[in-house]
Interface confidence: medium
């Protein structure tokens, strides 16, 4: 740092005073030198160090008529809203000729109310869950020191463990404000009041009761809701792409989800319109007067496959001999399920029924028994699933093939020559 | 404005007692809080109990068991009866309170003195 030779008498004849005082205070330092000829700029130290931006003035007064006369010069530092960056130690420097010269050091200082560094915020917590809350403030004068509220009341500290930063709440079960307090020699600062808003606990223990088709039955477990009795739960079902796979805890769905609202209590939901054989996931959240908990995380699950909710269409039964050609359309009615094949039910009016299991076909010749003498016979087609048989179509008669009667125009499978109505039951 | 006067500080023998008034007196209706506060010499001033309006009460731990503060609302006095007194309770203590609709309203009494002896 730059220091003052003793080679000649120092030109200052005004030095800084001592500045102190609270944050934000203004205040202005001087210093005043005289010195013969042209006047030298004045420059500000701040503990030794050269301010290059400060908020300096300098006047220059002179004593006499000739250029070469002394001179008085002043300059005057400006601090304005006083920060702990500015406490130090301030003196005027100036180079004249080949010397430097510093004058004698005033002091800024800062003593006031604590400062608050931190406050505590606003957050919302679930019921009886643990939490912590901060708080930091700064004199000087030090030591500060921190006291808690909550609802407006002091928090006692366990002796010894000084200023609490950090409070720790092991729980509420109503919402609750917190402030603090900060204590030093010069008076108590009060921060900013924080409002903890206490929400149900995340629901537990989602699971599926019943499986239909084209609905779900769920229940939960509802977390802790404090004081406050929770008013409703709102569920969630989205489909479920194949491999889309909704992690726990992972962003919402793409997809809107189907959402529906439960009276509580049950903690328990019958979830209809749903697709058959579908993936579905599905989450629930429960709310009370102070706002919703936290969904819980998806969970998979799986609507049942269910049977065919419609015959087969169109189906025509042609005789020609001793065959029938017998075909059929896939039903329009939902499938609910994967289409495992169809079964066939045909009687004459005095013999019993023959039903046979198709498969995938379509279409189905059969060898009728004799001389075709069989009268009466009709037909009746039903598709099915894993989950069983759909409805049967209404019966059919078999129409006897008249020339000119055009063919069916798909190729026909023809079953194997077998005893009439010796097929199995099923 | 409120103003606080403490009472009933002075000396007394390791295990014995001590019962501290505070005395409030002008706008004592915006007063929801109030408790107590002492300062040992080179110490820093903690909380000794504190009392609000409803039944809610707070203790520092080391004197839970000993202390109790209670209030006499028509008298518009706030009690500290300390028992089982220990040298470490040396102090002078302060009343304090918070008024209501803002907490940074605070009144601070003078301070009354305990001095306990082996």
């Known amino acids: 740092a730059p220091r003052g030779t003793q080679a000649e008498e120092s030109p200052f004849v005004g030095n800084p005073g001592n500045i102190t005082g609270a944050r934000g205070l203004t205040g202005t330092l001087r210093c005043q030198l005289q010195v013969q000829g042209e006047p030298p700029e004045v420059h500000w130290l701040r503990d030794g160090q050269i301010l290059e931006l400060a908020d300096s003035t300098q006047t220059q007064v002179p004593l006499g008529e000739d250029e070469q006369d002394d001179w008085i010069v002043v300059s005057q530092l400006r601090i304005t809203s006083l920060q702990l960056s500015d406490t130090g130690q301030y003196q005027c420097l100036v180079f004249l000729g080949h010397q430097t010269f510093v004058s004698q050091p005033g002091y800024v200082g800062l003593e006031g109310l604590p400062y608050f560094l931190e406050e505590p915020e606003d957050r919302t917590v679930a019921a009886n869950t643990p939490f912590n809350l901060s708080c930091q403030a700064q004199g000087p004068p030090e030591p500060v020191d921190l006291l808690w509220l909550q609802d407006a009341v002091p928090l006692a500290t366990a002796p010894g463990h000084g200023p609490q930063r950090s409070l720790h709440v092991p729980g509420l079960n109503k919402t609750s404000s917190f402030s603090c307090e900060a204590h030093n020699a010069k008076g108590v600062t009060t921060s900013r009041t924080a409002t903890i808003t206490v929400l149900p606990q995340q629901p537990r223990n989602l699971h599926l009761v019943s499986r239909q088709p084209t609905e779900l039955e769920v229940a939960w477990t509802p977390g802790l809701s404090g004081i406050y009795p929770l008013t409703h739960c709102t569920l969630q079902a989205v489909l479920s792409d194949d491999g889309m796979g909704i992690q726990a805890g992972e962003p919402d769905p793409p997809e809107e989800p189907l959402t529906s609202q439960a009276s509580v209590p049950p903690h328990q939901l019958r979830l209809g319109s749903l697709h058959p054989h579908t993936p579905y996931h599905i989450r629930v959240a429960c709310t009370s007067s102070q706002g919703p908990s936290s969904w819980t995380h998806w969970l998979p699950v799986e609507t049942p496959e269910g049977v065919p909710l419609g015959p087969p269409e169109n189906i025509s039964a042609t005789r020609n001999g001793s065959q029938a050609f017998v075909h059929w359309q896939e039903p329009r009615a939902p499938l609910q399920g994967t289409l495992l094949g169809y079964r066939l039910a045909y009687q004459g009016q005095d013999t019993p029924e023959v039903l046979m299991d198709i498969g995938l076909r379509q279409e189905v010749t059969l060898e009728l028994q004799g001389d075709g003498s069989v009268s009466n016979l009709t037909v009746c087609v039903a598709a099915y699933t894993a989950a069983g048989d759909g409805p049967w179509s209404l019966p059919v008669p078999l129409e006897a093939w008249r020339p000119g009667q055009a063919q069916p125009v798909h190729q026909l499978v023809k079953e194997p020559s077998t005893p009439a109505f010796s097929w199995p039951w099923w | 404005q409120v103003k606080l006067e403490e009472s009933g500080g002075g000396l007394a023998q390791a295990g014995g007692s001590l019962r501290l008034s505070c005395a409030a007196s002008g706008s004592i209706s915006s007063i929801n809080t109030i408790g107590w506060f002492r300062q040992a010499p080179g110490k820093q001033r903690e909380l000794v109990a504190a009392s609000d309006s409803g039944a809610n009460r707070n203790y520092a731990d080391s004197v839970k068991g000993r202390f109790t503060i209670s209030r006499d609302n028509a008298k518009n006095t706030v009690y500290l009866q300390m028992n089982n007194l220990k040298p470490e309770d040396t102090a002078i203590y302060y009343c304090?309170?918070?008024?209501?609709?803002?907490?940074?309203?605070?009144?601070w009494g003078q301070g009354t003195q305990v001095t306990v002896s082996s």
């Open positions: 304090r309170a918070w008024g209501t609709g803002t907490i940074s309203t605070m009144y």
